[in-house]
Amino acid sequence: VPLDPISVSNSSSQIILKWKPPSDPNGNITHYLVFWERQAEDSELFELDYCLKGLKLPSRTWSPPFESEDSQKHNQSEYEDSAGECCSCPKTDSQILKELEESSFRKTFEDYLHNVVFVPRKTSSGTGAEDPRPSRKRRSLGDVGNVTVAVPTVAAFPNTSSTSVPTSPEEHRPFEKVVNKESLVISGLRHFTGYRIELQACNQDTPEERCSVAAYVSARTMPEAKADDIVGPVTHEIFENNVVHLMWQEPKEPNGLIVLYEVSYRRYGDEELHLCVSRKHFALERGCRLRGLSPGNYSVRIRATSLAGNGSWTEPTYFYVTDYLDVPSNIAK
């Protein structure tokens, strides 16, 4: 089994994988096989309403901080970028040492498995069959920035629910054959996306490939700079009773997923007000509805917040409210 695989992302489309050769290989290592597949986001991320008061966004390695001048007033909800309770803490030095001690036993045990449960693999088609059972290992959203140490495994992985578009079973996982080195740069990946990487050492090329039990490692690519920007105009319609419906397009390929939108609006001469539009609310309104607006000229701008942080503010959109007819409430049904 390849030892101590680590994965680090150095860009929004690449992951660097490094490992050490097996300590006691069964024959000569001729090559390594590296498979990778995109991981669905945890279903909880789709379910949580990040506009609820007190609910923190998941901490993210590359998340830019909220700009202080833009987070002064949140009359609908308050949210801030801080470490939530969802993510694992960084390992201490003592924990790492303890894991290294455990790993020496693990390597001996895995070498035994390797010798007894040798895995022949045919790759004449150039692709491997997809394992339909994704790992249950929960990953921190910040893992990708850190070195991720993998635990080689032979256990079956229980099924987990898939909330984003999964890879269909008939699609084959991409893989690469690595000869004469213990590293690989995996390219052409989607930005800010988690990948499950499988690494095997092989000691025979033909006629039948003989490869070790797999080591698994997870990594997440870095965010794409403008992926969370709202593209296209923010449109508005002023209905009777001075209900203003704002509509905008969601970012096509966001970093992970959009968890909320911040709507910042102000009447000329007044202070800026903020609304938080949840993912669920947006899915129903394709924007938001404002009412209880005093007469006057208004400007509005919107930005999306993804798992990786904030997108850019849109250019301001302007509208004019003629008179005040409705009950004072900021967000309409």
Epitope: F46, T163, N241, M247, L257, R279, K280, L284, R286, K333
Partner: antibody, heavy 119, light 108 residues
Framework: EVQLVQSGAEVKKPGESLKISCKGS????????IGWVRQMPGKGLEWMGI????????RYSPSFQGQVTISADKSISTSYLQWSSLRASDTAMYYC????????????WGQGTLVTVSS | SSELTQDPAVSVALGQTVRITCQGD??????TSWYQQKPGQAPVLVIF???NRPSGIPDRFSGSSSGNTASLTITGAQAEDEADYYC???????????FGGGTQLTVL
């Protein structure tokens, strides 16, 4: 490709229970509301209700509140419409649809499930 | 009232322009969407929001709204446009949606 595939036609007797399904594929099922629409033979469309699979939040038309139950199982990307006690007047074609534009547009529809209730 | 009222039937000569209307108090406060349904088929969204057309819908279809009336206009009606058309909007309360009774369009 976005698809909503509904379960097959059903023939039931009055008083029986029934659960029909609508399976979504080709998109993030938890990110869009799913609606259910009834069309009785030779009649128009009737809006029944909607569900957000992410947290199973539901909204019903007053005409259907208490008459049917809309649910979803996000682990298998499926929404359900169920009756605890069918009546002859429930005979209709039932469509599920994705609210791709929220309240303002069901962009993808299932093929429909014909439910026939007859003694 | 939560009702949306449509004319039961409208006819148009091939190539001519036809307007199908939908009336209801809630249209003063909410967008309208329009669906086309042909016999034995599921409905198809043709107009949503502020006169938006889904991809694949010909530009001869357009929508507009004024006061409590929304309109679907087909400019240069084709034989394949013969179908039932339904308007759809929210109830005045905003808590649920309603369909109009439908308009059967005949292309002569």
């Amino acid at each position: 490709e976005v698809q909503l595939v509904q379960s097959g036609a059903e023939v039931k007797k009055p008083g029986e229970s029934l659960k029909i399904s609508c399976k979504g594929s080709g998109y993030s099922f938890t990110s869009y509301w799913i609606g259910w629409v009834r069309q009785m033979p030779g009649k128009g469309l009737e809006w029944m209700g909607i569900i957000y699979p992410g947290d199973s939040d539901t909204r019903y038309s007053p005409s259907f509140q208490g008459q049917v139950t809309i649910s979803a199982d996000k682990s298998i990307s499926t929404s359900y419409l169920q009756w605890s006690s069918l009546r002859a007047s429930d005979t209709a074609m039932y469509y599920c649809a994705r609210l791709g534009s929220g309240w303002y547009g069901n962009d993808y529809w299932g093929q429909g499930t014909l439910v026939t209730v007859s003694s | 009232s939560s009702e949306l009222t449509q004319d039961p039937a409208v006819s148009v000569a091939l190539g001519q322009t036809v307007r199908i209307t939908c009336q209801g108090d809630s249209l003063r406060s909410y967008y309208t969407s329009w669906y086309q349904q042909k016999p034995g088929q599921a409905p198809v969204l043709v107009i949503f929001g502020k006169n938006n057309r889904p991809s694949g819908i010909p530009d001869r279809f357009s929508g507009s709204s004024s006061g409590n009336t929304a309109s679907l206009t087909i400019t240069g009606a084709q034989a394949e446009d013969e179908a039932d058309y339904y308007c759809n909007s929210r109830d005045s309360s905003g808590n649920y949606a309603v369909f109009g009774g439908g308009t059967q369009l005949t292309v002569l």
